[in-house]
């Protein structure tokens, strides 16, 4: 045995965003012929010696961080990447609107605004068909997601969620969908993002996800453009999280 065993993967099926009352299965996948799997839930730490966890009815208490490992002989693997299991529908849905309009000429700017009826400090924006999300806090209980120099790839259906940073795995119901329509002819090819321009995250390495720049309420947002190289639409936002007030 040279070095630790490689880490397994931990996935939630059908999704890690689970409406209250719905079912979900967490599955730990390691190499063939594993002697023992250990699936852990964090905070507080507890474990089951199984490669899966079936949750027939999602409850608030099921939300949180999970990880898994496996044992071969007397050796343990590295732990999987942590999986965040999120309960949705815990709070009433926020509203999502586009400013100045949900019909945007190509090359113009648009801001998607998520507003919660509660004093929540965290908001998440999802685009239908993408695995990534864009999260950021906003002090004034509404999150502005600026999209600068809109391209055709930004067209699509968006939803947002809101939650409190003190309970980061308990989310609201999703907002009603907002359909963003990009009008006008295609412009010249957009710039290709570089590693200097964009933070590289785990999710940004996946196809069809382009990372966004860190944006705070006082910073001028960067241009976010879809590159024709290596990105297949639909276009999405990388999953990023910022502490309140950053």
């Amino acid at each position: 045995q040279s070095g630790p065993l490689p880490k397994p993967s931990l996935q939630a099926q059908p999704s890690s965003l689970v409406p209250l009352g719905q079912s979900v299965i967490l599955r730990c996948q390691g190499p063939p012929d594993v002697d023992l799997y250990r699936l852990e839930k964090l905070k507080p730490e507890k474990y089951e010696d199984q490669d899966f966890l079936f949750i027939p009815t999602m409850e608030r208490s099921n939300a949180g961080r999970y990880r898994c490992s496996y044992q071969n002989g007397s050796h343990w693997s590295l732990p999987s990447d942590q999986l965040e299991l999120i309960a949705t529908g815990v709070y009433a849905k926020p509203s999502l609107s586009a400013h100045p309009s949900s019909a945007v000429p190509q090359g113009r700017d648009v801001t998607l605004k998520c507003q919660s009826p509660y004093s929540f400090d965290e908001f998440v924006l999802y685009k239908e068909g993408d695995t990534g999300s864009y999260k950021r806090p906003e002090k004034w209980y509404r999150a502005n997601f600026p999209i600068i120099t809109v391209t055709a790839a930004h067209s699509g259906t968006y939803r947002c969620y809101s939650f409190s940073s003190s309970s980061p795995y308990l989310w609201s119901a999703p907002s009603d969908p907002l359909v963003l329509v990009v009008t006008g002819l295609s412009a010249t090819p957009s710039q290709v993002p570089t590693e200097e321009s964009f933070p590289v995250t785990e999710s940004s390495r996946r196809p069809s996800i382009l990372p966004t720049n860190k944006i705070s309420t006082t910073e001028k947002p960067m241009n976010i453009t879809a590159s024709p190289e290596g990105l297949s639409p639909p276009f999405g936002f990388a999953h990023q999280h910022y502490a309140k007030g950053n």
């Epitope: 507080p44 730490e45 507890k46 044992q71 343990w76």
Partner: antibody, heavy 123, light 112 residues
Framework: QVQLVESGGGLVKPGGSLRLSCAAS????????VSWIRQAPGKGLEWVSA????????QYAESVKGRFTISRDNAKNSLYLQMNSLRAEDTAVYYC????????????????WGQGTLVTVSS | QSVLTQPPSVSGAPGQRVTISCTGS?????????VHWYQQLPGTAPKLLIY???NRPSGVPDRFSGSKSGTSASLAITGLQAEDEADYYC???????????FGGGTKLTVLG
Amino acid sequence: QVQLVESGGGLVKPGGSLRLSCAASGFSFGDYYVSWIRQAPGKGLEWVSAIGGSGSAVQYAESVKGRFTISRDNAKNSLYLQMNSLRAEDTAVYYCARHYREFRWHYYYFDYWGQGTLVTVSS
Amino acid sequence: QSVLTQPPSVSGAPGQRVTISCTGSSSNIGAGYDVHWYQQLPGTAPKLLIYGNSNRPSGVPDRFSGSKSGTSASLAITGLQAEDEADYYCQSHDLGAHVWVFGGGTKLTVLG
């Protein structure tokens, strides 16, 4: 109420063998992880070995791996520790302890302990 | 040598407050695992005192409290009493080999 009672300790020569037992009562024994934990005279606590409820999941401290074997008989509500190739440094009070459990989950701490049994390895 | 580090001894007068530290590493306490504390009175088996960093089992007086931060934890005892004189052990879990780990123990002496 929950009770754990160890037995089988005694004086043994280096290289010898001994089998410890722990009789459990007051709870559904087969649902719980249980561990052996030892304490050398005047020293601190050292976890030795753990076994899952069905007996298929077992773990050992590096210091006893290959020499000690943990097992259980759920029909008899009993936990065992077979100790072979004993060394002077294995001299200690051996405790069995139950891991806390809630619903389907096991936790990483010990909520009940036995009173211990003394193992002395000396020529 | 124990995986978790505790001071060998602490002391205090009756009524005083004492704290016992427990320092681990990134593979145990720092990996997110909770810290638990046990009290061992002279000649007896250890007894669970604090679980999950700061929770007290029923029957444990609220003079005992625990906390955790980063790779370390601490146990605080206020209003020290003569019957608190005992050995105190911290315990956690290690992610690398999935083993249970203890501190070396701290002997609390109540003066006077």
